[in-house]
């Protein structure tokens, strides 16, 4: 189906302008057949007859409203993330992690303290089985919770006799001034003790241990 | 504008069936004017001419597809929340919190250890200013990270001389066997020390303190 | 001095910690508003369909038939 | 007076401040998929508009004009 | 031999595992409500399309052909 | 024994912990992208409606009136 369209004539008798003729179907037909249209430029009672143009405009307006609403809401979500104004403390509340279930999360790092005593290798294997490593100390600022840890726990620091350095499981060298290394026994592994102290211990000695996952 | 419609006549000369007449406008006009319509029941080349009926069906199908897609995706989100199968360790990895920025999060509780020494009242006020409380010990299981805390820190436990009991800031009585309370000095306030010990101290004595937010 | 010397301990926990019952950003009220707004928007569109498509019969259009070149029927 | 003399300590933890029961849930891949799917669905609808509304000119309709009762133009 | 004899320790932390500035929020009941609301809204729209677009044939329109200039059939 | 007695330390971190690489997933960049995507999709639909529905008047159609049975004007 299409539009019935002619061209203008100077012979008025030969043509009839459709000023008064109503070319609509029954309204029920119209409503079912002419949804979401735009009214063509025809002088007819568009508004009265639920013109497709008016209808289409309505849809467009509705979509525009939806757009405005959604943008407003998402902007609110966005701004709420940016400046969480619900909390009085600086820089909002936030989630920490992800971490294995029931691990400690601090500054987006995950820590777990294990009570069972194992040697260094077993401790490392235990951490690995949980997609983690033995504790790596990389920043006094980011890991300041460690200063409050009591007792001694295996960490992921091993001695490299060939060059005398201490290195972490990931191969990185221990940064100066991060840990104070103290010899407890002759050995190539290190226990973490409070206030950023490391105690040299024989790797086969059983001790509790700290596992860590870095998430940032 | 409307549909041009008549009724059937037995006078074939007087009427012309529109079998072969194409009543479409220029295609551009059609495409812009007749969006999202349903084709009326007229024998015409509907598919060929992008019938409104076909178009409307297409829209409905598209909306249906959107419905299916969105339900599928939200179901995936929902199921992922229910059984987070992405992680190999028991019961998934999870986020912890929400907590104030840079607080320790453990089992959805938030903790912060403050270095500055304050008396009990100042410590309590400091925690309150951060929408938190002084440490409340309510479960050895949920708060087992506390067993590793070294040193002494104010917690939210106060002595009620009238009945000799110890109660938390929220008015709840200290449960038996949660803390072992030991007198360090005569007083009505308590310091938390490692392994779930509480030390009685004069409330005006300056000490470091632990703030806590419960999120569950 | 002891705690007793204070007439009362300071009022505590005036509100929940950051409200945010489960997120900093997508708090419950926000999510509820989001769903509601989307629902309202969708209903607006559906409403528009019904509202605009409602038949408004003009007086001359009694029978829903179309007559062409019938000026007398104007 | 001592703390004990207070009839009750102020109410504490009046409400929870979050449960996060199953965060992680909205992981990056999932959210990306969600946005992409919604985008695709929207584009499908827009595409449908253009696709369905595309004019397919029949051979006899050369000029886009409509002639009525012109059998010779059949 | 000691660890030093290994040319390199295994690669560690190859990628990040998330930053999470705001999650949880989508708890199970909330997600369920969200899914339901989206489903209902979508179905409403789809339903409206089909409902409104349902053809209502008038009795005289048996054959779907259009006749013009048939005043006697008015 | 010392660490050296192990030929190599076991391979570590085979994958990120729990994928969810960036929960909070609703991080700022992600949220921004989400808003943008929704905005673009909505604008596309709105734009399509207006664009497609824009009247394109042909030169002869000055007044919006329809003339029928004017073969001479063919």
């Amino acid at each position: 189906m299409g539009w019935i369209r002619g061209r203008r004539s100077r012979h008025s008798w030969e043509m009839s302008e459709f000023h008064n003729y109503n070319l609509d179907l029954k309204k029920s037909d119209f409503s079912t057949r002419w949804q979401k249209q735009r009214c063509p430029v025809v002088k007819s009672k568009c508004r009265e007859n639920a013109s497709p143009f008016f209808f289409c405009c309505f849809i467009a307006v509705a979509m525009g409203i939806r757009f405005i609403i959604m943008v407003t809401i998402w902007s609110a979500v966005f701004l709420n993330s940016l400046f969480n104004q619900e909390v009085q403390i600086p820089l909002t509340e936030s989630y920490c992690g992800p971490c294995p279930k029931n691990w400690i999360c601090y500054k987006n790092n995950c820590y777990q303290f294990f009570d069972e005593s194992k040697n260094w290798y077993e401790s490392q294997a235990s951490c690995m089985s949980q997609n983690a490593s033995l504790l790596k100390v990389y920043s006094k600022e980011d890991q300041d919770l460690l200063k409050l840890v009591k007792s001694y726990h295996w960490m992921g620091l091993v001695h490299i006799p060939t060059n005398g350095s201490w290195q972490w499981e990931d191969g990185s060298i221990l940064s100066p001034n991060l840990l104070t290394i103290i010899e407890m026994q002759k050995g190539d592994c290190a226990l973490y003790a409070s206030s950023f102290k490391g105690y040299i211990e024989n790797c086969s000695t059983p001790n509790t241990y700290i596992c860590m996952q870095r998430t940032v | 504008m409307g549909w041009i419609r008549g009724r059937r006549s037995r006078h074939s000369w007087e009427m012309s069936e529109f079998h072969n007449y194409n009543l479409d406008l220029k295609k551009s006009d059609f495409s812009t004017r007749w969006q999202k319509q349903r084709c009326p029941v007229v024998k015409s080349k509907c598919r060929e001419n992008a019938s409104p009926f076909f178009f409307c069906c297409f829209i409905a199908v598209a909306m249906g597809i959107r419905f299916i897609i969105m339900v599928t995706i939200w179901s995936a989100v929902f199921l992922n929340s229910l059984f987070n199968q992405e992680v190999q360790i028991p019961l998934t990895e999870s986020y912890c919190g929400p907590c104030p920025k840079n607080w320790i999060c453990y089992k959805n509780n938030c903790y912060q250890f403050f270095d500055e020494s304050k008396n009990w009242y100042e410590s309590q006020a400091s925690c309150m200013s951060q929408n938190a409380s002084l440490l409340k010990v309510y479960s050895k299981e949920d708060q087992d990270l506390l067993k590793l805390v070294k040193s002494y820190h104010w917690m939210g436990l106060v002595h009620i001389p009238t009945n000799g009991s110890w109660q938390w800031e929220d008015g709840s009585i200290l449960s038996p066997n949660l803390l072992t309370i030991i007198e360090m000095q005569k007083g009505d306030c308590a310091l938390y020390a490692s392994s779930f010990k509480g030390y009685i101290e004069n409330c005006s004595t300056p000490n470091t303190y632990i703030c806590m937010q419960r999120t569950v | 001095t002891t705690p007793g010397e204070r007439s009362s301990l300071p009022a505590f926990y005036p509100g929940t910690s950051g409200s945010c019952s489960g997120c900093g950003s997508l708090s419950l009220p926000l999510l509820a508003g989001l769903v509601a707004a989307d629902a309202v928007a969708s209903l607006l569109i559906v409403g528009a369909v019904f509202l605009c498509a409602r038949p408004r019969r003009s007086p001359a259009q009694e029978d829903g038939k179309v007559y062409i070149n019938m000026p007398g029927r104007g | 007076t001592t703390p004990g003399e207070r009839s009750s300590l102020p109410a504490f933890y009046p409400g929870t401040s979050g449960s996060c029961s199953g965060c992680g849930s909205l992981s990056l891949p999932l959210l990306a998929g969600l946005v992409a799917a919604d985008a695709v669905a929207s584009l499908l609808i827009v595409g449908a508009v253009f696709l369905c509304a595309r004019p397919r000119r029949s051979p006899a309709q050369e000029d886009g004009k409509v002639y009525i009762n012109m059998p010779g133009r059949g | 031999t000691t660890p030093g004899e290994r040319s390199s320790l295994p690669a560690f932390y190859p990628g990040t595992s998330g930053s999470c500035s705001g999650c949880g929020s989508l708890s199970l009941p909330l997600l369920a409500g969200l899914v339901a609301a989206d489903a209902v809204a979508s179905l409403l729209i789809v339903g409206a399309v089909f409902l409104c677009a349902r053809p209502r044939r008038s009795p005289a329109q048996e054959d779907g052909k259009v006749y013009i200039n048939m005043p006697g059939r008015g | 024994t010392t660490p050296g007695e192990r030929s190599s330390l076991p391979a570590f971190y085979p994958g990120t912990s729990g994928s969810c690489s960036g929960c909070g997933s609703l991080s700022l960049p992600l949220l921004a992208g989400l808003v943008a995507a929704d905005a673009v999709a909505s604008l596309l639909i709105v734009g399509a409606v207006f664009l497609c529905a824009r009247p394109r008047r042909s030169p002869a159609q000055e007044d919006g009136k329809v003339y029928i049975n004017m073969p001479g004007r063919g």
Epitope: - | G164, W166, N177, L178, T180, E183, M184, Q185, K186, F196 | - | - | - | -
Partner: antibody
Framework: EVQLLESGGGLVQPGGSLRLSCAAS????????MTWVRQAPGKGLEWVSI????????FYADSVKGRFTISRDNSRNTLYLQMDSLRAEDTAVYYC??????????????WGQGTLVTVSS | SYVLTQPPSVSVAPGQTARITCGGN??????VHWYQQKAGQAPVLVVY???DRPSGIPERFSGSNSGNTATLTISRVEAGDEADYYC???????????FGGGTKLTVL
């Protein structure tokens, strides 16, 4: 009425071991800390060890640390003191006592009658 | 570790007031408890938390504590009060219970 009854004392050689028991009744045993105090013949009271109600916390006098172990069985309302590597100076009457405050280590409100341990060759 | 010092003995006539002291560094900041032990018997708590009395203990027994000295006061002393008296505190720094050496009260 609170009752505490010690048992298990006797004569033992230096380096030997002995296990003392204290049966408690008349109170909720599991929420009170319990202690062992000894008194050498003609001497004053000397604290030996204390255990919290849950058994989580144990404290020892320096003179017995590493040799004595305090424990409790809350299901049986019984307190124990395992004494190893006994020395002559461990000879004393051993009293079991109940803490006076249920969440606090403070004072000893109730005492048993004591059991005599003699370490001699 | 913390040390409590008591006089080995105190003598008092019946009906008089006996004062038994217990000295310790800043003992006034600690809660002091007092036990009575009669010959051949187990100790009995007579005063706790400096000055509180358990039920069944006569009002004649009272306590005070300030500075570096805690005092157990027995007024209107009776012959039956003759016993050894021990002071006790908790040393929170070392997690030890500390007893004084004991004071033998003799009723003349």
């Amino acid at each position: 009425e609170v009752q505490l009854l010690e048992s298990g004392g006797g004569l033992v050689q230096p380096g030997g071991s002995l296990r003392l028991s204290c049966a408690a009744s008349g109170f909720t045993f599991s929420i009170y800390a319990m202690t062992w105090v000894r008194q050498a013949p003609g001497k004053g009271l000397e604290w030996v060890s204390i255990i919290s109600g849950s058994g989580d916390h144990t404290f020892y006098a320096d003179s017995v640390k590493g040799r004595f172990t305090i424990s409790r069985d809350n299901s049986r309302n019984t307190l124990y003191l395992q004494m190893d590597s006994l020395r002559a100076e461990d000879t004393a009457v051993y009293y079991c006592a109940k803490e006076g405050k249920w969440v606090q280590l403070s004072h000893f409100a109730n005492w048993g009658q004591g059991t005599l341990v003699t370490v001699s060759s | 570790s913390y040390v409590l010092t008591q006089p080995p003995s105190v003598s008092v006539a019946p009906g008089q007031t006996a004062r038994i002291t217990c000295g310790g560094n800043n003992i006034g900041s600690k809660s002091v408890h007092w036990y009575q032990q009669k010959a051949g018997q187990a100790p009995v708590l007579v005063v706790y938390d400096d000055s509180d009395r358990p039920s069944g203990i006569p009002e004649r027994f009272s306590g005070s504590n300030s500075g570096n000295t805690a005092t157990l006061t027995i007024s209107r002393v009776e012959a039956g009060d003759e016993a050894d008296y021990y002071c006790q505190v908790w040393d929170g720094r070392s997690d030890h219970v500390v007893f004084g050496g004991g004071t033998k009260l003799t009723v003349l």
